[in-house]
Interface confidence: low
């Protein structure tokens, strides 16, 4: 049995007057079903006179009645062609057709802009059967229209593999202007021209644009959207926005800040990360960038010693990572360090100067006049040397390091001795007989170990030999060390 659907008790009174065949708009339909995926129930209809012919697709029935009269062509009745309404309002529209009852398996589907509307749309199809014909009304409702609902809607019906298409119903949703392009924040050079763009659309069209700078309108006459504002140049920061007007009212874009590029602020918090004898690692916090990216930074270094000539060393580096290792500095020296950074406009002032010191350096000169003796009676080697001349920045002498290497057939062994700073002689035990002992000495400060002296060799004979003369480094300017035995 056919049951009445819950959706509606009566058809919508969408048509002026009765349908052909005495079907009144207040008749209750036998069946009213929500449209889903194009499916409709198959019903037997009985024919009656069709409505006005349709300008779109029609289906010419090839079947004849009992009296052999040809059936008239099928077509959707004309309905409203263009609906204009405001955003968020509700709308209902429909298409209708009268179908002879000889046709089975009729389906009506809704299409928008060439695509079938499936799923969760409020589409309802109502059937009004008569003896010979069934009037079908397909209604489509939108409870709160949005701009995306704008478009051309049609009904399609398939009968016996024939497709019947209704006239389009154009839905035009009107509302306040909608921005498709808003001005963007910019950082600009002082007194240099730049452009801002604003574009908004309806419907309704046209959309007119007013520009606003710091709360005051720039143009007295509106420009049609899209609008490009050419600002000849600014001397100080300004905020711009645009107003879009149409018949429904006005919409205001976001306000965008146009900043004037300036030289950066000086870096802050310059600090010492690490110091060695000849380098200092510094870091800094960049100042405000003046609305233009930092390009590079300059580290300025001057000796803090009042007796220095006041010359400034300059080291250039990239702006990131706010770290720089200053190299080639003197040991045990005081320096003033400042940092300046630049953007496309120019250099910042120098940061507050900070004081930094390098640590002691290692000695730069080896001990002089190294002499080596063999003391056979005590089975020792005596070593003597002269303290090297030290520079102040090499730091305080804390001692000496002695390297002695023992070499005989198949054996080579290096030993190291540490000697206090006051001595200028040392005694080491003979490690191997019938071997060569090679001695080198280096001075040591807190800054490290200096260079080793030239090697001095002495032969240590097997037990029982006599006559041992000293070995020594040559006087300055002489050739290689001489071994005297």
């Amino acid at each position: 049995a056919i049951t009445e659907a819950r959706e509606e008790a009566k058809p919508y009174p969408l048509f002026p007057g009765p349908f052909p065949g005495s079907l009144q708009t207040d008749h209750t339909p036998l069946l009213s079903l929500p449209h889903a995926s194009g499916y409709q129930p198959a019903l037997m209809f009985s024919p009656t006179q069709p409505g006005r012919p349709h300008t779109g697709n029609v289906a010419i029935p090839q079947v004849t009645s009992v009296e052999s009269k040809p059936l008239p062509p099928l077509a959707f009745k004309h309905t409203v062609g263009h609906i204009i309404l405001s955003e968020h309002k509700g709308v209902k529209f429909n298409c209708s057709i009268s179908v002879p009852n000889i046709y089975q398996d009729t389906t009506i589907s809704w299409w928008k802009d060439g695509k079938e509307l499936l799923g969760a749309h409020h589409a309802i199809t109502q059937f009004y059967p008569d003896d010979e014909v069934t009037a079908i009304i397909a209604s489509f409702s939108i409870t709160s229209v949005q701009r995306s609902d704008n478009g051309s809607y049609i009904c399609k019906m398939k009968i016996n593999n024939e497709e019947i298409v209704s006239d389009p119903i154009y839905i035009e949703v009107q509302g306040l202007p909608h921005f498709t392009k808003q001005p963007e924040s910019m950082n600009v050079t002082r007194n240099t021209a730049f452009n801002l763009t604003c574009q908004a659309v309806g419907p309704p069209e046209p959309v007119n644009i007013f520009w606003v700078q710091n709360s005051s309108r720039v143009n007295e006459q509106p420009e049609k959207s899209p609008s490009v504002l050419t600002v000849p140049g600014l001397t100080e920061m300004a905020v711009f926005s645009c107003e879009a007007h149409n018949d429904k009212g006005l919409t205001v874009s976001k306000g965008v800040q146009i900043n004037i590029k300036a030289i950066p602020s000086p870096p802050t918090e310059v600090s010492i990360r690490n110091s060695t004898a000849h380098s200092i690692l510094i870091s800094w916090v960049p100042g405000f960038d003046g609305y233009s990216p930092f390009r590079n930074c300059s580290i300025q270094v001057k000796e803090a010693d009042p007796l220095s000539n006041g010359s400034v060393m300059i080291f250039n580096t990239s702006a990131l990572p706010h770290l720089y290792q200053i190299k080639q500095l003197q040991a045990l020296a005081n320096y003033s360090i400042g940092v300046s950074c630049m953007n496309e406009i120019g250099w910042s002032a120098v940061s507050p100067w900070i004081l930094a010191s390098t640590t002691e350096g290692a000695p730069s000169v080896a001990p002089l006049n190294v002499t080596v003796f063999l003391n056979e009676s005590s089975d020792n080697v005596d070593i003597r040397w002269m303290k090297p001349p030290t520079k102040q920045q090499d730091g305080e002498l804390v001692g000496y390091r002695i390297s002695h290497v023992w070499q005989s057939a198949g054996i080579s062994k290096e030993l190291l001795e540490e000697v206090g700073q006051n001595g200028s002689r040392a005694r080491i035990s003979v490690q191997v007989h019938n071997a060569t002992c090679t001695v080198r000495i280096a001075a040591v400060t807190r800054g490290g170990v200096g260079p080793f002296s030239d090697p001095v060799k002495i032969f240590i004979p097997a037990h029982g030999w006599v006559d041992y003369a000293p070995s020594s480094t040559p006087a300055p300017g002489n050739a290689d060390p001489v071994l005297i035995i």
Partner: antibody
Framework: QVQLQQPGAELVKPGASVKLSCKAS????????MHWVKQRPGQGLEWIGM???????NYNEKFKSKATLTVDISSSTAYMQLSSLTSEDSAVYYC???????????????WGTGTTVTVSS | DIQMTQSPASLSVSVGETVTITCRAS??????LAWYQQKQGKSPQLLVY???NLADGVPSRFSGSGSGTQYSLKINSLQSEDFGSYYC?????????FGAGTKLELK
Amino acid sequence: QVQLQQPGAELVKPGASVKLSCKASGYTFTSYWMHWVKQRPGQGLEWIGMIHPNINTNYNEKFKSKATLTVDISSSTAYMQLSSLTSEDSAVYYCAKRSPYSNYDWYFDVWGTGTTVTVSS
Amino acid sequence: DIQMTQSPASLSVSVGETVTITCRASENIYSNLAWYQQKQGKSPQLLVYAATNLADGVPSRFSGSGSGTQYSLKINSLQSEDFGSYYCQHFWGTPLTFGAGTKLELK
């Protein structure tokens, strides 16, 4: 004096979203980074991310799909939208400000009052 | 990401005592460290920035020290208003991370 005002509390259902606000006053809003920090009940502090009205945003990778930071320059207000909320998101959320344009100077001398977000059905 | 390991997790002390809280970074953060105090139900407050600098209005009994990866906050002669939680935070690049906190309780 510099102030960051935040609503006291928000009660939201699991799966929903919430948009927290932080209204700044007493300083030039467009010159400073605004940071957001999360603190779960009885727990420590977690940095969510930061936004500069004139520059851009920088998120903690952990919160990239959870938080969206925006600003409204006209009202000097920063916003953080939290999406797909679960009980793990129940926490106090603070906004906090520090100095402008300083890559390595992001400590916070001014904190908001904090908004307590409770996620419960 | 840089991990900040704070210790101890809690500390029971009396007024007048001196306490030291430490914070260890998983890598060198070059003194880019801040300390905060947070009282129950309140927002955190900055105490120390750049490892050693006292923030405006912070009493001189607070002091920060350290470099590299090891940092500490010292509170001399603890006052009753000093009880609460303390957090360290590095700002050597993003993401910024905080220590888990140290809760200072009255013995």
